[in-house]
């Protein structure tokens, strides 16, 4: 069971009398309607709160929104409506927040029937001021600030046209027309896709994919015949119809488009897709949905270029386009993600991967569990993640897993010990070494984050009665303290704090109903009197990720390195502090098999680590032979996993083989075995 | 099996340094922490700090900081204990001892495998 | 740092007894707990690691209990190779020691 309040554990002296001095009450004075809530900048403590009332009458909807301004974290609200003129903001487009600690924010408001433009307010001192700026088009999607120059911003237009601006929106010019799909890639780059024949829906399969680096002064068709397009990590994807039928497959370019490599990967009809799960400047992981209606597909992970896949994971939980996927990274420990697969017999199970992808398991059963009515044999089972999907189906899950890079090895995640996912009410658990080992840590669904860089958790029961009451822990889970903040219950409808989580201060959300009315309330509680001192070097205790076996020379590598870390002590009491620094000492691992994957043509058969090559291409392999690039298709038959650092030990050197002689089929015509495309 | 083998007694004026070693034979030597205790005359035990081999990243006990240095030597699996600027309070019963590891916590489970004990005399 | 005090700190006691030594942190240290058995002129021998797991080759007449800031050894039937000091050690953060049991023939 999880640790009781009531247990002789971690009690933080007179913590009632600390909190309560830094307990701060804001009634927002406005009906309630819906709230948004954004942080502006880094470690500024400024907070926007935009509160919107919607009333619809016959002919149209009467609408009123405010907005509020913290510079303390959420402790005191300033109503600063009159900036924005007392203007109806959309909050379909919430609050466009600029990016680093740009103190940029730019807010859409709602204009007349009639007008010629849309209307935004904009400020670059952290909303201390707004400017008014009326726009020549209407916006259908939010401003998007690129990442390297916050002056800089793009527009789609509700007419198609592609907008950008270089001033930070005061002035606007249209860049290109009939555009669907508009993104910013690296240095200012924008990539975007056009369509030709009427519309973005009409012309799916048959867009073109453009480059401007020069914010639209000139523009270069890097694609055509697309589907549509992805960015991620140094990856630029694009799925490419096939010319001869309904086909579609994924390319993939580095250099920004400039070159394409046909990725090899399973080719996709019209009604399945690619998802881009994860990506980073090493590797992508890639789901590719499985024909028909099955709400699954497969997990495939590349290689340094992004070309050659190898299959991680099958039967991957994923509905439908867009639909619901629980796959999660980890940000606590490198390598780590999490997802469901669907069973056949359609239970939901979860899996874990330590290796970036390389092998899947299943979680470990908590320590001091049992197996729940799921489980067929009720000694052996494993715990089983609430996610996207058990959010989706309206379990009662209120959150998704939880993990902050600045907190080392915490996960914390609803869920359910058996055979697979269970409809019954979940509890929370949590892990302390990025998910190896799992305890229970509350009883039961609740809303939960993570303060001080793990120096402090924070959790309120998810519960349909008004509450009152916060718990936290300062010992990673193990202990918890109940603390109430008010004398008067508030229907509870968020937890917030600073992203990145290095505040010490939490906002708790929800309303008071009365008779007639009822308010936004907020509480924000300052946790920095719980932790009095700073952390010195004597509350930090050494920890290996990812150790499994000391006994084992290399025990603790993944992708060819071990990382030491100084972890905070469970018993420390302190401060890590906002500036605080994860110190880790990396050492290099040995090159074993296990650090390379089979290239193009290889495979490893099961339970032996060489790589063996395939018979036969066949299926996608075999167009990837046919139509991919001839370099790709030379190959000793491995190469080194994406990200991976190890050096010396094994070093698989064998003979180079062209694979080009393996091309051959009887359905194809000679002249399509021959050519190759870029 | 593990074992750990110290250096022999040593004999020490005050205000001199002494440097027991510690070498370890039959395991994985680089994995684990290895830790220092001493031990007074009848007198209880006391940690002075420890070490993990892979990396040399060694912490102290306060009392001893500044005046012990603990170091590695992954070639030989061999583990050193100096202690500097000795006083007739130091005269005690050095032990060097591998920290058990069950996780990636080095120093969570106990000692598990402990030296002989190296005798260390400060006397004028 | 943790204080780590252990009382009684001279038990006497007879074969066949079953005797407890308690140790107390001055603050929680969870279940990051040792206890070991030293005899004179020998280095100490772990008994209890995370406060209750029984090290292998250990007899499973000690057992070990306790979370947060109060913890107990116990020996179910005290044999006469169980005469020695006790010692109890916690281990989140800096290393510290309990000052000692001396368990004696009555």
């Known amino acids: 069971s999880a640790p009781g309040e009531d247990e002789e554990c971690g009690r933080v002296r007179d913590f009632v009398a600390k909190l309560a001095n830094n307990t701060h009450q804001h009634v927002f004075d406005d009906l309630r309607g819906s709230v948004s809530l954004s942080w502006v900048g880094d470690s500024t403590g400024v907070i926007l709160v935009l509160t919107t009332f919607h009333v619809p009458l016959v002919i149209m909807t009467f609408g009123q929104s405010k907005l509020y301004r913290s510079e303390d974290y959420g402790k005191n609200f300033k109503d600063i409506t009159d900036l924005i003129n007392n203007t109806f903001i959309r909050t379909e487009f919430g609050m466009a927040i600029g990016p680093e600690n740009s103190g940029k924010v730019v807010l859409t408001a709602e204009v007349s029937g009639g007008s010629r433009g849309g209307r935004i307010f904009r400020s670059s001192d952290f909303a201390k001021n707004f400017v008014q700026t009326d726009l020549p088009f209407h916006p259908l999607t939010q401003m998007m600030y690129s990442p390297q120059n916050s002056d800089y911003l793009l527009a789609l237009s509700t007419e198609n046209g592609l907008w950008v601006s270089k001033n930070f929106g005061g002035k606007w010019e249209e860049i290109h027309k009939a555009v669907c799909l508009a993104k910013w890639g690296s240095d200012n780059t924008i990539f975007f896709t056009t369509y030709a024949n009427g519309s973005c829906k009409a012309d799916l399969g048959a867009l073109e994919l453009w480059r401007t680096s020069d914010l639209g002064k000139s523009f270069k068709t890097i694609g055509v015949k697309i589907y549509s397009f992805g960015l991620g990590g140094r990856f630029l994807f694009a799925s490419v119809m096939a010319d001869k039928d309904t086909t579609r497959r994924i390319h993939v370019s580095t250099d920004q488009g400039d070159t394409w490599s046909m990725a090899q990967l399973p080719s996709v009809g019209q009604e399945q897709f690619y998802s881009i799960l994860a990506a980073n400047d090493d590797m992508v992981f890639m789901h590719v949905d499985e024909p028909g209606d099955t709400g699954f597909g497969t997990i495939f992970t590349s290689d340094d270029r992004g070309i050659v896949y190898s299959k991680s994971l099958d039967r991957h939980l994923y509905t439908t386009t867009g639909g619901e996927t629980d796959f999660t990274n980890v940000t606590s420990l490198r390598g780590v993600y999490i997802t469901s697969v669907l069973s056949e017999d359609n239970s939901i199970q979860t899996m874990i991967t330590f290796d970036q992808g390389g092998r899947w398991t299943h979680l470990r059963k908590p320590e001091n569990s049992e197996c729940d009515a799921t489980a067929k044999n009720k000694n052996e089972c494993s715990l089983h993640i609430h996610a996207s999907y058990s959010i989706s189906q309206k379990l009662n899950v209120p959150m998704a897993p939880l993990s902050e890079p600045n907190a080392v090895g915490i996960v914390i995640a609803h869920g359910s010990v058996g055979d697979a996912i269970s409809v019954m009410v979940p509890d929370v658990y949590i892990s302390d070494d990025g998910g190896y080992s799992w305890t229970k840590m509350l009883e039961g669904p609740h809303y939960y984050t993570i303060l001080d860089s793990g120096g402090i958790i924070v959790a309120i029961e998810h519960s349909s009665r008004p509450i009152n009451v916060i718990k936290f822990s300062t010992d990673e889970g193990q202990c918890w303290q109940t603390y109430t903040f008010t004398r008067d219950p508030i229907y509870f409808t968020g937890l917030a704090s600073e992203p990145g989580a290095r505040s010490m201060n939490i906002s708790i959300w929800g309303f008071t109903e009365s008779f007639l009315t009822s308010q936004w309330v907020s509480y924000t509680i300052d946790f920095k009197d719980i932790l009095e001192r700073n952390c010195e070097e004597k509350d930090y205790t050494i920890w290996l990720a990812h150790s499994t076996d000391p006994e084992d020379y290399e025990d603790g590598c993944i992708l060819g390195y071990k990382e030491q870390f100084l972890r905070l002590a469970k018993s420390s009491v302190c401060q890590n502090g906002r500036d605080y620094v994860v110190t880790k000492q990396p050492s290099i691992c040995l090159c074993s098999l296990e650090d390379f994957l089979c290239d193009f043509g290889y495979y490893r058969p099961e339970n032996d680590s060489k790589c063996v090559e395939q018979p036969e291409l066949k299926g996608h392999d075999l167009e990837f032979c046919l139509y991919g690039r001839e370099e790709h298709l030379t190959t000793n038959g491995y190469r080194k996993i994406p990200g991976d650092k190890c050096q010396g030990g094994v070093n698989p050197v064998r003979e180079v083989k062209d694979l080009k002689k393996k091309c051959t089929s009887n359905f194809l015509s000679p002249e399509k075995q021959n050519s190759k495309s870029n | 099996q593990v074992q750990l083998v110290q250096s022999g007694a040593e004999v020490k004026k005050p205000g001199s340094s002494v440097k027991v070693s510690c070498k370890a034979s039959g395991g994985t030597f680089r994995n684990y922490a290895i830790s220092w205790v001493r031990q007074a005359p009848g007198q209880g035990l006391e940690w002075m700090g420890g070490?993990?081999?892979?990396?040399?990243?060694?912490n102290y006990a306060q009392k001893f900081q500044g005046r012990v240095t603990i170091t590695a030597d992954e070639s030989t699996s061999t583990a050193y204990m100096e202690l500097s600027s000795l006083r007739s309070e130091d005269t005690a019963v050095y032990y060097c001892a591998r920290q058990g590891r069950k996780t990636g916590y080095y120093y969570y489970y106990g000692m598990d495998v402990w030296g002989q004990g190296t005798t260390v005399t400060v006397s004028s | 740092d943790i204080q780590m005090t252990q009382s009684p700190s001279t038990l006497s006691a007879s074969v066949g007894d079953r005797v407890t030594i308690t140790c107390r942190a001055s603050?929680?240290?969870?279940?990051?707990l040792a206890w070991y058995q030293q005899k004179p002129g020998k280095a100490p021998k772990l008994l209890i690691y995370k406060a209750s797991s029984l090290e292998s080759g250990v007899p499973s007449r000690f057992s070990g209990s306790g979370s947060g800031t109060e913890f107990t050894l116990t020996i179910s039937s005290l044999q006469p190779d169980d005469f020695a000091t006790y010692y109890c050690q916690q281990a989140d953060g800096h290393i510290t020691f309990g000052g000692g049991t001396k368990v004696e023939i009555k």
């Open positions: 070490i993990i081999p892979i990396g040399g990243w060694a």
């Open positions: 603050q929680s240290i969870s279940s990051w």
